[in-house]
Amino acid sequence: GSERTCCPVNWVEHERSCYWFSRSGKAWADADNYCRLEDAHLVVVTSWEEQKFVQHHIGPVNTWMGLHDQNGPWKWVDGTDYETGFKNWRPEQPDDWYGHGLGGGEDCAHFTDDGRWNDDVCQRPYRWVCETELDKASQEPPLL
């Protein structure tokens, strides 16, 4: 089958997911497309433990995650519920700031230098993190 049972080369395994950390920048949509072409998605942070893991690997660098409000409400790219899920915004964020002079507000979320989240202009070329889940079935013991 096409189920993934181990992480690809250059990806990091953690808690049954695989993560890939970029070392260059792209706009949010281009980063999202890169991950999709790798059969993955921009990272979806579902716990404080996952937040600390990602933060440890990216360091103090602005880095895109799979969270945006380009169509109105905030949404995770994999469908994880935003309202009831984990959040780690900086104080006063998200603020949809229009004062940057680039047109429009701020619709894409990124990790800031201290790991907390901020919304920013989606066209900014930030680093990004891809995530793909390992085959759920492979965690179960084989049927005898």
Epitope: P8, R23, S24, K26, Y34, R36, L37, D39
Partner: antibody
């Protein structure tokens, strides 16, 4: 030796269909995204479509969206381009290539030898 | 879409010459730029990726540089087998787009 071999090109009338195949040898395509690029004397090289390793995600140039479909059969180490509603401007040499993920992007190498598609009445 | 332009469109050179080809993107593509060589009747061959990384098996007389919107391919000392057409390609954003090509022919 890593090789890609296209087939399925030929002469077709406007509005007709063709299915191109790209057979890989020397490597397993299930580990890679794969892509199609075409070349015409007038427009030069034009990226057409790309498909992820599992086949779950694909992307298309606007000029072919809704008419062309990329697909793959990893068990046969082959991928395809189904071309419908063909137009004269689709006349080109069609190349397949491996799309290797390195340094934060996808790079096309190697390429097949190409197959000629001619759309004419 | 990101437009790619190349200059010159053709260049006449002699064996041993240093040849420089430039590629310009209509917007910033960071270092997501490739260079290809194509000979008549053959498929393009990847020479350089990520603006300056030499593809395996490509001779070191080929080099690439640049970032953002302006890029350069240099052939330090032209050999007979280098007479061909050279294309740049951006892989920053879909649709990935190619330059129109630069033909290097014999003076």
């Amino acid at each position: 030796e890593v090789q890609l071999l296209e087939s399925g090109g030929g002469l077709v009338q406007p509005g007709g269909s063709l299915r191109l195949s790209c057979a890989a040898s020397g490597f397993t395509i299930s580990n890679y995204a794969m892509t199609w690029v075409r070349q015409t004397p007038g427009k030069g090289l034009e990226w057409v479509s790309v498909i992820s390793a599992s086949g779950g995600n694909s992307f298309y140039a606007d000029s072919v969206k809704g008419r062309f479909t990329i697909s793959r059969d990893n068990s046969e180490n082959t991928f395809y381009l189904q071309m419908n509603s063909l137009r004269a401007e689709d006349t080109a040499v069609y190349y397949c290539a491996k799309a290797r993920a390195v340094a934060g992007s996808h790079w096309f190498d190697p390429w097949g030898q190409g197959t000629l598609v001619t759309v004419s009445s | 879409d990101i437009q790619m332009t190349q200059s010159p469109s053709s260049v006449s050179a002699s064996v041993g010459d240093r040849v420089t080809i430039t590629c310009r993107a209509s917007q910033d593509v960071n270092n997501y730029l490739a260079w290809f060589q194509q000979k008549p009747g053959k498929a393009p061959k990847l020479l350089i990726y990520a603006a300056s990384s030499l593809q395996n098996g490509v001779p070191s007389r080929f080099s690439g540089s640049g970032s953002g919107t302006d890029f350069t391919l240099t052939i330090s000392s032209l050999l007979p087998e280098d007479f061909a057409t050279y294309y740049c390609q951006q892989t920053n954003s879909f649709p990935f787009t190619f330059g129109p090509g630069t033909k290097v022919d014999i003076k």
